[in-house]
Each structure stands twice: as structure tokens, then as C-alpha cells.
């Protein structure tokens, strides 16, 4: 009978046409949602003046439905049995899931003025923006509509700039008619052991962020796993997003809609300091911020996106260094809210429930040059936004699962 | 040695153009801003442009705006400044300078005379 | 403009301040010794001093106010001394209107 199974499973994952999971790796039969914090600052004008802490209070959720298009330019490539593919993106706002429209005014970080003073240290050059940012009346916080904050808007400032720059900005701009790609995984037809496992990402092994090891692309997508599962594994994944390869380890078994799983969580030791965990060394890559690599729980992405200081952390600074979250006030950070997980059928690998979290922060910099920038006396991560990206199996798949699976086995 | 020679300059007319070149040598020119100044007989000191190591940003002084054009070629080791509309105004040595990388200069050029009469 | 008094004296061996102030930062000092005779940097980014300038000259800045020291003046210390800086309400490095150093 086992041997039966194994062989049933064996034949279904594989990523072909045909297969049970083709059709539901293709199009995802489950509603994935991304609800969105966003941190607003409460207090502008006195850090402005005087660098005191910035007081922030998110608001949220803000609700999109996402991941609810096709993968488009689907290839097998029989020689090497790799399957590669675009992952289309696409958000449509559920306001019966949100509290309140796209419209909601923020008061955030002025994204151009921070990102411009890190982007061009060179002194001159921040004379030469200042007048661009007194000229545009811009300040180091603007007050933003949601569907600006994420999607974009046309910078003031930034339009001032004589030089070619873009001159929309947006957390997510651009975003919907884009896709993430491509990727070229293994369709397990050769080795089930291999299936989904990414082979190239944008037709690289690499990404060219990172120095060492850290630059390696690790493990799926997280949308599925090698099937047999077992709890002693460390489950690595790629999420681009973040910008790296990161991983899973087990943490309990969970009953989901009548399905065994395994909960997989990230480990507060994926965002430790070299000092903490060594292997994080090539995860550092600045020694200032980071006051000599014994930061932890913040990742510099900045090399990912064309020189802003974007840092990735966990919600409210979870597991963070109390020095990252010093200068803001307001952040009540909690494992059962803010923690990302996975919940993994172990004997077909699909990932049936999940939650990432993640937390987009800005650095902003004194800089003598920049007016608006002149009076801080220290550097701030500044908090954004922060995201909950969740899918869970429907009540249908899951019976489903029950009948052709699980049941199978029980 | 830094070196910074400028010339262009002499006796001009007044509403015509006027292109100045300051040819630098002694030092990695395309590491550093460079700016022109301007002194009129009796008279103190007037930052007139500046231009970025790379060529990209400019900035000019109230006086001049919209008349001047800082310009540079990496290549050659030369600042170039055009200014048109000339005004009696205009006349003084105009020095060319390094930018030592904060907004403060380093090292100057001999200047040349600009005389803009008719 | 940046605001320096206009007129300083000492006699030789006396220590001499000069004081700019109006600007935001990194402010340079540039000895001019005859009009039309090109100027010289004595002080550069509040406090350097280019390599063969005598030790006698040194810089110091402190908030939007800039110091600038001969210690033990010398004859061919008389100049006019002009200092420059970046005034943040205006697009660009601006100049002091001078200040002339009489050696008595």
C-alpha cells in the first residue's frame, strides 16, 4: 500500500501537465490576501527640529487580494527537466477587508528626500539637491495617500532633478502589469527530490547582492516543497521580496481543516548578528548602521533596489537589537502576530497555509547639506509599512486533500 | 602639483557670449566637483557655478542664473564655463577652483581678466 | 552673505581670531595678498590645512560660526582674508566680504 502511495505521489507532484499539482501550481486554487500596516508618524516636526523619537501609530489592515493571476510564459525544457515561468503581479483592494479606503492620508518618511541624500553623499551634489527640495517645498515627511504610498506617485522634488531620474516613487512602484521572473525550477520528472527547487532566477544561480554563500538561490519558492517531509529538515526557500534565500525549521504539528501538517516557522537565528550566528557574516554588508555587524533583525537590501536605503526586518523590529528600534516609539512587537510560517502537507510538500510577514523601513541620515536633514543628530530606521501575505487551502481543496491524500494513507 | 589654468578671457562686448576653460592637471580630475569664482576690480569674492565629479549636477550663483552653463570633460581634465548675455557686471578675474569634496575649496587657478565694455 | 569684520591688526608674534559666521557648514579660508592676485587657501573643511601652509594657521567651526587662528602673526601675514562657506538659504558656497590683517 505504501509503496503504491509513494509511487501516486511521486507521479502528481511533478510539474507537467496532467498532474494534480501542475493545475494548482499554474493558477493557485487558494485566495492569497496581503494587508497592509502602515506606520504613521505622529510627531514630524519635532524630530525634524529637534531628532527626538518618531512616534509612530499604524493603521491598518489595509486589504489586497494578490498571486490571483497565472504563471505566464510557462516553458518544460526536457533537456535539463525545468519548468520556467514568469509569476505575473496584480493587487485589487478588498475595502470589506480593510478599514478604510485608498484614499486614507498618511504622514510618512519623504521616500525621495531620504533615499536622494543616501544615493549622492557627494556634498556639492547635496547643495544642489537642497535647492531642489526647498524649491519643491518638500520636507523629510509628507503626508501620502495609501494608494500613493504603495503604488506611486509623481515626486515634486524628484521632477526638479536635471538629471535622468525616475521621478515616480512608490513602496511597490510599479507593481501590477509587472511580473517576478523568470524562474526556471525542476519539474521533479527526473529526481522527485528536485521538484520545484529553483535552478535559475532572472538566468542566474546568483543574485548579485550578496558576497559569498549568501548569494546563493536556495531551495523553492515556498509555494510547495519536495514531498515526504520530514520534521528534522530545514526547509530553504527564495523569496524576492527580501531580496535573499532564507529558511524553515519545524515547529509543530497543527490540524489543518481535517489535514495533518507541520508548522514550519522562521527561527529567530535566520535574522541574528554574525556575532550571534556566523553564518549571517555575508548578510553585513556595511559597518556603520549596523555598528560593526551587531545589529541584528534588520537587512540592508539596499544593492537589490538600485542604491535606496531600504531595510528589510520583521514587524514592529521582532527579534531586532534593541539599538534598531531606539529611536521609535510605539512598536509592540509579537512573535504569534509578526512571526512568518508555513504549514506544509508533508507527504505531497504543498504548502496549504502560510503567513509572511515583513516590515519595509527606510535609513534616513543627518546630512549638513540638506536642510531638512541637518538637524538630526543620528540615524533612524525609519518604519513604513508592514505586510501579512496569507493563503489558506479552501474548504473544497481541502476535502479534496482529505479524500485523495491524507485519507489514503489514514 | 595641482594645476588648474584658466583661460577664455580678455576684452568682451556686452550681449554677446563668453566661454572660459580651465584645464586642470596634477591630480585625478574626475574625483572632484569643480567651481568658478569671480572677483570684480575692488571687489570681493562671488561663487559663480559648480559642477559635480561626473558631470550631472550643476549649480550656479543668483547672479548668473540662466545665463551660465558649467560643463565639463572628464577626459580632457576641462571645465568649461559659457556665459551669455554679458553685462558690464560681468567684468572681473574669474578664477577656476577644486572643491575638496564638502563645499570648500582646495586649490585655485591663476584667473583670467574678463573686460565686458563696448 | 557670510558676515567677517572687516578690518583686523596685531603686531608680529601676536595671536589673531577671525570669526565667520551666517553659514551651515565646512567653511574654507582664503588669503588674498593684492587685488586681482589670485587667492590661496589657508584653511579648508573648517580645519585643514593644505600641506604647505605654516602650522601658525588653523580652523575651527562650531555650529553656524567658524574661527580662524594665526597664532604668532608675521609681516607677510597681512592679507586680506576671505572666508567661504555654504549658506542653506541660498543655492550655493558664498563668500564673506573680507577681512584686511594689518601687521603693525
Known amino acids: 500500500g505504501d509503496m503504491l502511495i509513494q509511487k501516486t505521489i511521486k507521479k502528481e507532484v511533478v510539474l507537467e501537465e496532467g498532474t494534480i499539482a501542475f493545475k494548482n501550481w499554474v493558477k493557485t486554487g487558494t485566495e492569497i490576501y496581503r494587508q497592509f500596516w502602515i506606520f504613521d508618524v505622529q510627531n514630524p516636526q519635532e524630530v525634524m527640529m529637534n531628532s527626538s523619537n518618531i512616534q509612530v501609530k499604524q493603521r491598518g489592515p489595509y486589504t489586497y487580494r494578490v498571486r490571483f493571476l497565472a504563471k505566464e510564459n510557462i516553458t518544460q525544457d526536457p533537456k535539463d527537466n525545468t519548468v520556467s515561468f514568469l509569476q505575473p503581479n496584480g493587487a485589487i483592494f478588498e475595502p470589506s477587508l480593510s478599514v478604510g479606503t485608498e484614499a486614507d492620508n498618511f504622514t510618512v518618511l519623504n521616500l525621495a528626500v531620504a533615499a536622494a541624500s543616501h544615493i549622492y553623499p557627494n556634498p556639492f551634489v547635496q547643495v544642489v539637491l537642497n535647492s531642489l527640495i526647498n524649491k519643491s517645498k518638500s520636507s523629510m515627511f509628507q503626508v501620502r495617500t495609501l494608494r500613493e504610498l504603495l503604488w506611486g506617485y509623481t515626486d515634486p522634488f524628484l521632477s526638479l532633478v536635471p538629471y535622468p531620474v525616475s521621478t515616480r516613487v512608490g513602496m511597490f512602484y510599479p507593481y501590477n502589469n509587472t511580473a517576478d521572473g523568470v524562474y526556471k525550477v525542476f519539474n521533479g520528472k527526473d529526481s522527485i527530490s528536485k521538484v520545484a527547487i529553483i535552478d535559475t532566477y532572472k538566468g542566474k544561480r546568483n543574485l548579485s547582492y550578496w558576497e559569498s554563500y549568501c548569494d546563493m538561490i536556495n531551495g523553492t519558492d515556498a509555494a510547495s516543497f519536495p514531498p515526504f517531509v520530514e520534521k528534522s529538515q530545514v526547509l530553504q526557500f527564495f523569496s524576492s521580496d527580501i531580496c535573499r534565500s532564507i529558511y524553515a525549521v519545524f515547529e509543530s504539528d497543527v490540524n489543518l481543516k481535517g489535514i495533518p501538517v507541520y508548522r514550519f516557522v522562521l527561527p529567530s537565528k535566520a535574522f541574528a548578528s554574525p556575532v550571534q550566528n556566523p553564518d549571517n557574516h555575508c548578510f553585513c554588508t556595511e559597518k556603520i548602521i549596523s555598528k560593526n555587524c551587531t545589529s541584528y533583525g534588520v537587512l540592508d537590501i539596499s544593492k537589490c533596489k538600485e542604491g535606496k536605503p531600504v531595510y528589510i526586518s520583521l514587524p514592529h523590529f521582532l527579534y531586532a537589537s534593541p539599538d534598531v528600534s531606539e529611536t521609535i516609539d510605539g512598536l509592540n512587537p509579537n512573535e504569534e502576530e509578526h512571526r512568518t510560517y508555513l504549514d506544509i502537507e508533508p507527504i505531497t510538500g504543498f504548502t496549504l497555509q502560510f503567513a509572511k510577514r515583513l516590515q519595509v523601513n527606510l535609513l534616513v541620515k543627518p546630512s549638513n547639506k540638506i536642510q531638512v536633514l541637518k538637524r538630526l543628530k543620528r540615524n533612524y530606521i525609519v518604519p513604513i509599512l508592514w505586510l501579512n501575505e496569507t493563503g489558506t487551502i479552501g474548504d473544497e481543496k481541502a476535502k479534496m486533500f482529505r479524500s485523495q491524500v491524507t485519507g489514503k494513507i489514514n | 602639483a595641482v594645476t588648474l589654468d584658466e583661460s577664455g578671457g580678455g576684452l568682451q562686448t556686452p550681449g554677446r557670449a563668453l566661454s572660459l576653460v580651465c584645464k586642470a592637471s596634477?591630480?585625478?580630475?574626475?574625483?572632484?566637483?569643480m567651481f568658478w569664482v569671480r572677483q570684480a576690480p575692488g571687489k570681493g569674492l562671488e561663487w559663480v557655478a559648480g559642477i559635480d565629479d561626473d558631470g550631472s549636477f550643476t549649480l550656479y550663483g543668483a547672479a548668473v542664473k540662466g545665463r551660465a552653463t558649467i560643463s565639463r570633460d572628464n577626459g580632457q581634465s576641462t571645465v568649461r564655463l559659457q556665459l551669455n548675455n554679458l553685462r558690464a557686471e560681468d567684468t572681473g578675474t574669474y578664477y577656476c577652483?577644486?572643491?575638496?569634496?564638502?563645499?570648500?575649496?582646495?586649490?585655485w587657478g591663476h584667473g583670467t581678466e574678463v573686460i565686458v565694455s563696448s | 552673505a557670510l558676515t567677517q569684520p572687516s578690518s583686523v591688526s596685531a603686531n608680529p608674534g601676536e595671536t589673531v581670531k577671525i570669526t565667520c559666521s551666517g553659514g551651515d557648514s565646512d567653511y574654507g579660508w582664503y588669503q588674498q595678498k593684492s587685488p586681482g592676485s589670485a587667492p590661496v587657501t589657508v584653511i579648508y573643511q573648517n580645519d585643514k590645512r593644505p600641506s604647505d601652509i605654516p602650522s601658525r594657521f588653523s580652523g575651527s567651526a562650531s555650529g553656524s560660526t567658524a574661527t580662524f587662528t594665526i597664532t604668532g602673526v608675521q609681516a607677510e601675514d597681512e592679507a586680506v582674508y576671505y572666508c567661504?562657506?555654504?549658506?542653506?538659504?541660498?543655492?550655493?558656497?558664498?563668500f564673506g566680504a573680507g577681512t584686511t590683517l594689518t601687521v603693525l
Open positions: 596634477g591630480f585625478t580630475f574626475s574625483s572632484y566637483n
Open positions: 577652483a577644486r572643491d575638496s569634496g564638502a563645499v570648500s575649496i582646495d586649490a
Open positions: 567661504g562657506g555654504w549658506d542653506g538659504s541660498y543655492d550655493g558656497a558664498v
